[in-house]
């Protein structure tokens, strides 16, 4: 399956627009940083076949939606805003839902990728215990905006990597 | 390969104005911070302030605001730092380094090989 | 503003030699501690970050320790190319600022 353009034009798009979402000073919130531990390996495209790779990608696009789609998030961020990072993730979860199902059978992708994609939730389960430690307080929220931000232009870097290769 | 390359050196009058700069290459430039760091002659580092370049939003330390200002050009990954009015105390190396933000990542990774500003009259 | 204290200001040592350095700051700053090496005419290197973390490609006789207010650098076998000034800084919160340094002589 080669990633269409228009999947990496809207990963640049969320990544702009998560940059847009900030409301307050991030030089307050240094000493909130947190070591999310992001799971690095689970997208190496060396290691992992591309199949692994692209369901890690749906998984942590689907994650990040259920995390943004929270009403602590709708309290924290501009609704417009937020409305059209909510479009962009739906897009992109249909574009790499095609690309799944094309490189692998239905079936199989449950059982191949599990590792991946439960490494990906546990990524965001400590996001979320981080988020509810901090009283999902508005520094808490702008480190995991800047955290969101760093794993999708990993990802976006990858996916250009995956189109190379066909 | 992650580069900060730093304006050259700078011989000035006292009252004079300069700006000095630091390009980012290798990297995202929007993704890390610059931060700007003064060493006078013989002396230790001070941390004078910091940009963010996505938006150009910064920070000084008490003792430089008012005194300089940063600034950045993300369309040229380029950050400065400025005098409106120099003073012979400004005499020093100045470097700049990256700064990860809010990230969990090394802080100033990265050094500028500093600009050299002697202000003399 | 957070006072990063260190100590010695200067010290002798020889080639192979244990040598530690602290760093202590005024109010507790967690693990958001650096250290890093300057010697003449060059910019500083970071070494350690977030107090214990090795930087990649740093040698591994460097280490750091520490949590709080109280921090150590140390170097286990002092090598020739080591004889530098060491800084540490803290990233807790702005202002950032530095130690004042402690300067590695050859004894």
């Known amino acids: 399956c080669d990633l269409p353009q228009t999947h990496s034009l809207g990963n640049r798009r969320a990544l702009i627009l998560l940059a847009q979402m900030g409301r307050i000073s991030h030089f307050s919130c240094l000493k909130d940083r947190y070591d999310f531990g992001f799971p690095q390996e689970v997208f190496d495209g060396n290691q992992f076949q591309k199949a692994q790779a692209i369901s890690a990608f749906h998984e942590m696009i689907q994650q990040t939606f259920n995390l943004f789609s929270t009403k602590d998030s709708s309290a924290a961020w501009d609704e417009t805003l937020l409305d059209k990072f909510y479009i962009e993730l739906f897009q992109q979860l249909n574009d790499l839902e095609a690309c799944v199902t094309q490189e692998v059978g239905v079936e199989e992708i449950a059982l191949m990728n599990e590792d991946s994609i439960l490494a990906v939730r546990k990524y965001f389960q400590r996001i979320t215990l981080y988020l509810m430690g901090k009283k999902y307080s508005p520094c808490a929220w702008e480190v995991v905006r800047a955290e969101i931000m760093r794993s999708f232009s990993f990802s976006t870097n990858l996916q250009k990597g995956l189109r190379r290769k066909d | 390969e992650v580069q900060l390359v730093q304006s050259g050196a700078e011989v000035k009058k006292p009252g004079e104005s300069l700006k000095i700069s630091c390009k980012g290459s290798?990297?995202?430039?929007?993704?890390?911070?610059i931060g700007w760091v003064r060493q006078m002659p013989g002396k230790g580092l001070e941390w004078m302030g910091i940009?963010?370049?996505?938006?150009?939003?910064?920070a000084y330390s008490p003792s430089f605001q008012g005194q300089v200002t940063i600034s950045a050009d993300k369309s040229i990954s380029t950050a400065y730092l400025q005098w409106s009015s120099l003073k012979a105390s400004d005499t020093a190396m100045y470097y700049c380094?990256?700064?990860?933000?809010?990230?969990?990542?090394?802080?100033?990774?990265?050094w500028g090989q500093g600009t050299l500003v002697t202000v003399s009259s | 503003d957070i006072q990063m204290t260190q100590s010695p200001s200067s010290l002798s040592a020889s080639v192979g030699d244990r040598v530690t350095i602290t760093c202590r700051a005024s109010?507790?700053?967690?693990?958001?501690l650096n250290w890093y090496q300057q010697k003449p005419g060059k910019a500083p290197k970071l070494l350690i970050y977030?107090?214990?973390s090795l930087q990649s490609g740093v040698p591994s006789r460097f280490s750091g320790s520490g949590s709080g207010t109280d921090f150590t650098l140390t170097i286990s076998s002092l090598q020739p190319e080591d004889f530098a000034t060491y800084y540490c800084?803290?990233?807790?919160?702005?202002?950032?600022?530095f130690g004042q340094g402690t300067k590695v002589e050859i004894k």
């Open positions: 380094a990256r700064h990860p933000g809010l990230n969990w990542a090394p802080d100033f990774d990265y």
């Open positions: 290798g990297y995202s430039f929007t993704s890390y911070w």
């Open positions: 940009i963010d370049p996505s938006d150009s939003d910064t």
């Open positions: 109010q507790s700053i967690a693990d958001f």
């Open positions: 977030f107090a214990s």
């Open positions: 800084q803290q990233s807790h919160s702005f202002p950032l600022t």
